[in-house]
């Protein structure tokens, strides 16, 4: 079995000749790719096109968020006859073309993943030279970034009536469950605020009233791990302030 450029084999009538039928533009991307924060991920993208064995100038583009209008995170250009796609844009230097664009492969490698990279990505190819044509994936590939919990902020704040409250904010994917422990608390899930708009991986838990001096510990946990951080409350007798 011999594969033609579109992975099909056609026998011409009464002959042994395999022909490559006229192609249409198409792009093949998986719906989702998952990887852990700190690791690298590969966003696969292959395409077919109607221009047979095009070897003219070519530009490969990846954008984030939305097709056609989203910000570009990667762009490279290959000269006529060249497999070498010279990078013109790589956001934070973390994106590089892994596929061979001359073999219709625009797969992209993303290094040092962060939770902020969790979004949809769209590949695009542009032909120049004798042929002027372009095509972009409409549905894109969702990059799902998972991460063990990390406590990004823990603090004690004054509240009305000379009282104090504690706040703990953590990030992770899946979003971590938060629990407080401390003097006279045992283990308390406390009041957990749902993830904030635009900050889907951040979760905040509040201890509304700290009644005892001592050490208060916030623990964040999800299926990938756990993290904890502590604050200390020491109130000066006869004063309305506190040392934390």
């Amino acid at each position: 079995f011999v594969r033609t450029k579109i992975d099909t084999t056609e026998n011409l009538l009464n002959t042994e000749v395999h022909s490559s039928p006229a192609q249409r533009w198409s792009m093949q991307v998986p719906p989702e790719v998952s990887a852990e924060a700190g690791d690298a991920a590969v966003l696969p993208c292959t395409f077919t096109h109607p221009h047979r064995h095009y070897d003219g100038p070519l530009t490969a583009i990846w954008r984030a968020g939305e097709p056609y209008a989203g910000p570009q995170v990667f762009r490279c250009a290959a000269a006529r006859g060249s497999e070498l796609c010279q990078t013109a844009l790589s956001l934070h230097g973390r994106f590089r073309l892994l596929g061979n664009p001359r073999r219709n492969d625009l797969s992209l490698r993303v290094e040092r993943l962060a939770l902020a990279d969790d979004r949809r990505y769209f590949c695009r190819v542009e032909f120049a030279g004798d042929v002027h044509d372009r095509y972009e994936s409409r549905h894109g590939v969702r990059l799902h970034v998972t991460a063990a919990p990390r406590i990004v902020n823990i603090s004690v704040l004054p509240s009305p009536a000379h009282a104090f409250r504690a706040l703990c904010t953590a990030e992770g994917e899946p979003p971590p469950a938060l629990a407080w422990s401390g003097p006279a608390l045992g283990n308390s899930l406390a009041a957990v605020r749902s993830p904030r708009e635009g900050h889907g991986h951040l979760v905040t838990a509040e201890l509304p009233a700290l009644t005892h001096d001592g050490r208060y510990t916030c623990t964040a946990a999800n299926s990938l791990g756990r993290s904890e951080a502590s604050v200390y409350l020491f109130r000066f007798h006869g004063a309305s302030g506190a040392s934390t």
């Epitope: 011999v2 033609t4 450029k5 395999h18 490559s20 497999e83 070498l84 061979n100």
Partner: antibody, heavy 120, light 106 residues
Framework: EVQLQQSGAELVRPGASVKLSCTAS????????MHWVKERPEQGLEWIGR????????EYDPKFQGKATMTADTSSNTAYLQFSSLTSEDTAVYYC?????????????WGQGTLVTVSA | QIILTQSPAIMSASPGEKVTMTCSAS?????MHWYQQKPGTSPKRWIF???KLASGVPGRFIGSGSGTSYSLTISTMEAEDAATYYC?????????FGGGTKLEIK
């Protein structure tokens, strides 16, 4: 089955010309680039150039520009390589090659080679 | 043009031995391709896009590298691996081959 059948060995005089043929079966040459590669015992492989048989678009290694002429006849599914003003440096085996089935890498199918000997 | 320099030009290895040959490019390339040729036969595509094995190539062959430095490694040499190996670049016209590494069996 994909095959490239090349013409037989040639013994030619210095200064003469020679035209080699490569007939493809199993695919239409108009759908894929056809390449010519030169092999000499001590020099290894050299890419001469490639032709797009459908529109005649050609790319040569500058070293062979003026020396080699690539043509193709899609009606007979045959590619040709003509060498002119032959010298002893042109004594070599010449292969025609296709990028058919490039999903599995370049230069997928090679002809059996044609030995050209330039000798007085 | 991009000049590909292969080393060593000739080498020999015993069965079971690990073998590494290199291909150095005069300018940066994005991929390297490798071909195997045995005496009296046409070359065969062997490794493409630096590290992908062509159909039928045993898994003991490993291609690696980037930029200007590439290598082909055979994890455990076998008698049938004795051949000449050529690297090839398509990162700029004119496309070029290396001078080849002839691998002999001891």
């Amino acid at each position: 089955e994909v095959q490239l059948q090349q013409s037989g060995a040639e013994l030619v005089r210095p200064g003469a010309s020679v035209k080699l043929s490569c007939t493809a079966s199993g695919f239409n040459i108009k759908d894929y680039y056809m390449h010519w590669v030169k092999e000499r015992p001590e020099q290894g492989l050299e890419w001469i150039g490639r032709i797009d048989p459908e529109d005649g678009d050609i790319e040569y290694d500058p070293k062979f520009q003026g020396k080699a002429t690539m043509t193709a006849d899609t009606s007979s599914n045959t590619a040709y390589l003509q060498f002119s003003s032959l010298t002893s440096e042109d004594t070599a085996v010449y292969y025609c090659v296709t990028d058919y089935d490039y999903d599995g890498g370049w230069f997928a199918y090679w002809g059996q080679g044609t030995l050209v000997t330039v000798s007085a | 043009q991009i000049i590909l320099t292969q080393s060593p030009a000739i080498m020999s290895a015993s069965p079971g031995e690990k073998v590494t040959m290199t291909c150095s490019a005069s300018s940066s390339t994005s991929f390297m391709h490798w071909y195997q040729q045995k005496p009296g036969t046409s070359p065969k595509r062997w490794i493409f896009d630096t590290s992908k094995l062509a159909s039928g190539v045993p898994g003991r062959f490993i291609g690696s590298g980037s930029g200007t430095s590439y290598s082909l490694t055979i994890s455990t040499m076998e008698a049938e691996d004795a051949a000449t190996y050529y690297c090839h670049q398509r990162s700029a016209y004119p496309w070029t081959f290396g001078g080849g590494t002839k691998l002999e069996i001891k």
